[in-house]
């Protein structure tokens, strides 16, 4: 018997029935990965970040991104003055489109957006926008951080020098300097209307490889209100091939986004293949772990008064956000294996990042459906190192969903792990 496992992260109530619909219907499409010359990589598992270096040597370099920016060690660089933006205030054309790449959601820019200044060697043209986000409820999803503080979403805009290259891809393939801006999104109580075209677009690219044209938006409105306070350092692409060719501009001030708008990011799917198990998963936690600074220096802009009245409380007070209630990233490497006809073993690995250590125990929740009834049980594994649990009295004709959550001191919790769906006696796909 081949056990067919589909991984889904945690959803809302009523989810089990919806999942049944997907399994027996065709709402969730399982796609085979297209044959391609690029090495396969993922954000976790056997092809995760720690393994990227095996197929992309640069990923093991000394000038990698992302990084944590410690403000107190960033030196003011007099050469880092006001950014000059050209075309950013124009509405985008109807040819601008969004794609679910399976690793991120990308906006392919079809209009002329230029940036210069900030120590960039020339006038750079914007090529695309990519997003990185967390798991749920505003949990940490940004790649960069400031003083250890991560944000729910990081938007990255990539630029190349059109005077030197005919395309962005040529600049990458020839290992030449490109520019990138990192913009943090932070939870706020109200919707940010400037994001509406993006959020609307996300709903059109829920599934892997989907594409959609975007309603007009103003790129400048997706940037922080004040652009004067930014950090500069030289780093890399944060995905394979991890080329060390990126001049990073990381804006200190975030852009607001509501919980409601964040949900559009958390609703994006991808497809993965681990071993012989094909899975449809939510695309979440699509960020690379942070890299060492090594011999690099981070600089900060010298724009007059730009660092005054800055959101220092906002950045340094960890009590002010929902994300701060999360004590770690989710438990990872969830596996469900049958022990015998009536017992399953759930295993997992410790979260990659623990914001408020140590983990004291783990909560295992599992639910199942039988005869259209839904039941749920939760129990505590009172250990931080024996990361497996046995579920007894398993019914072979029930559909089981498992998820694990770390519990830290003060009863703080991690995000939930992926929800693993398990049913025996299913057919091969």
């Amino acid at each position: 018997v081949l056990h067919y496992v589909v991984c889904f992260p945690a959803l809302t109530e009523g989810y089990v029935g919806a999942l049944h619909e997907n399994r027996h219907g065709s709402a969730v499409q399982i796609r085979r990965r297209k044959a391609s010359g690029d090495p396969y990589w993922a954000y976790s598992g056997a092809y995760g970040p720690e393994h990227w270096v095996t197929s992309s040597v640069s990923c093991g370099g000394r000038h990698q991104s992302p990084i944590d920016i410690l403000d107190q060690y960033a030196r003011v660089g007099e050469e880092y003055q006001e950014l000059q933006l050209d075309g950013f205030d124009n509405e985008s054309s109807n040819k601008t489109w969004m794609k679910n790449t399976g690793k991120t959601v990308a906006i392919l820019l079809k209009d002329d957006y230029f940036v210069s200044g900030a120590g960039l060697p020339g006038r750079f043209k914007a090529e695309k926008v990519e997003f990185h986000w967390g798991h749920s409820n505003g949990s940490a999803g940004s790649e960069h951080s400031i003083n250890g503080r991560r944000f729910p979403v990081e938007m990255q805009i990539f630029f190349y020098n059109p005077d030197d290259f005919d395309s962005f891809q040529t600049a990458i393939s020839e290992n030449r300097i490109i520019g990138a801006m990192a913009i943090f999104f932070q939870v706020s109580p109200r919707d940010n209307s400037a994001l509406d075209p993006i959020i609307h677009g996300l709903k059109g690219v829920v599934h892997h490889e989907k594409e959609t044209f975007l309603d007009p938006f103003v790129l400048r409105d997706l940037l922080p209100a004040s652009l004067g306070s930014y950090y500069r350092y030289t780093g890399s692409l944060t995905t394979p091939p991890c080329s060390e060719i990126v001049e990073w501009i990381v804006f200190r001030r975030p852009v607001p986004i509501s919980y409601h708008q964040l949900e559009a990011f958390y609703s994006i799917f991808t497809t993965e293949q681990q071993d012989h198990v094909k899975s449809v998963e939510y695309l979440r936690n699509n960020f690379r772990p942070q890299q060492r600074l090594h011999d690099r220096v981070v600089s900060k802009s010298a724009v007059r008064d730009s660092w005054n009245h800055d959101m220092t409380d906002f950045l340094e007070n960890p009590l002010g956000t929902e994300a701060s209630k999360v004590c770690s990233s989710p438990p990872i490497h969830m596996k469900v294996q049958p022990l015998n006809q009536t017992a399953l073993q759930v295993s997992w690995s410790q979260p990659e990042t623990i914001y408020h250590p140590p983990i004291m125990n783990y909560m295992i929740s599992y639910s199942w459906t039988k005869n259209e009834d839904e039941k749920e049980k939760t129990f505590t594994k009172d250990s931080d190192k024996d990361l497996k649990a046995t579920i007894s009295h398993v019914s072979p004709d029930s559909l089981y969903l498992f998820r694990v959550q770390a519990v830290c001191r003060n009863d703080m919790r991690s995000d939930f792990s992926q929800t693993m769906l398990f049913q025996a006696n299913t057919t091969r796909i």
């Epitope: 250890g148 960890p318 009590l319 408020h356 250590p357 250990s383 190192k385 024996d386 001191r409």
Partner: antibody
């Protein structure tokens, strides 16, 4: 190099309140859980308490009520009340790292309680 | 509360291997850390999470854990290893978190 230093240790009489202060160099205190550990002369190490990154504090059962740990972005304080001769010890400020261990220790500050 | 038990003293010949033990009911489900303290100095972290060694600690020091016992092994003992060695762990949940040190083992290197 990353280091910690404790201040405030002195000779005091029983019942006197005392506050010890810890400062860091080479890293930001605000991003770590910080603890206080003490060692009486010729004795072993004794955990007093820990303050987490959110300001949540945890204490050894014997320390509750008499010892209070607080923090700012640049210091971690240990307030001690109702001190007795058996509280004579070297008090260490320590950084909690790796989730489960104390990786940086201050040199310690000696508190002597004597009448 | 819980107690970590360590032998009060252990002797080892120069160049030999010695194992220091730490036992407690909680150690089957909790990680142990190990510290070295020389007279008049602050302790130094040797091992965390049972087996991990911080950078700068010689690989002569290794940690292991089995059941309710955590073990610190020093191979090729040197005169400079003469010190007190403490194990520690934490337990509890919610707001009842506790951290406990063992009573310490005084290691004497002879020869």
């Amino acid at each position: 190099a990353q280091s910690l230093e404790e201040f405030g240790g002195r000779l005091a009489t029983p019942g006197t309140p005392l506050t010890l202060t810890c400062t860091a160099s080479g890293f930001s205190l605000g991003t770590y859980s910080m603890s206080w550990v003490r060692q009486a002369p010729g004795k072993g190490l004794e955990w007093i308490g820990t303050i987490g990154g959110r300001g949540d504090a945890y204490y050894a059962s014997w320390a509750k009520g008499r010892f209070t740990i607080s923090r700012t972005s640049t210091t971690v304080d240990l307030k001690m009340t109702s001190l007795a001769t058996e509280d004579t010890a070297t008090y260490f400020c320590v950084r909690e790292n790796y989730g489960y261990a104390f990786d940086i220790w201050g040199p310690g500050t000696l508190v002597t309680i004597s009448s | 509360s819980f107690v970590l038990t360590q032998p009060a003293s252990v002797q080892v010949n120069l160049g030999q291997t010695v194992s220091l033990t730490c036992t407690a009911d909680t150690l089957s489900r909790r990680y142990a850390s190990w510290y070295q303290q020389k007279p008049g100095q602050a302790p130094v972290l040797l091992i965390y999470r049972d087996t991990s060694r911080p950078s700068g600690v010689p690989d002569r020091f290794s940690g292991s854990s089995s059941g309710n016992t955590a073990t610190l092994t020093i191979s090729g003992a040197q005169a400079g290893d003469e010190a007190d060695y403490y194990c520690a762990t934490s337990d509890g949940s919610g707001s009842s978190y506790q951290c406990v040190f063992g009573g310490g083992t005084q290691l004497t290197v002879t020869g």
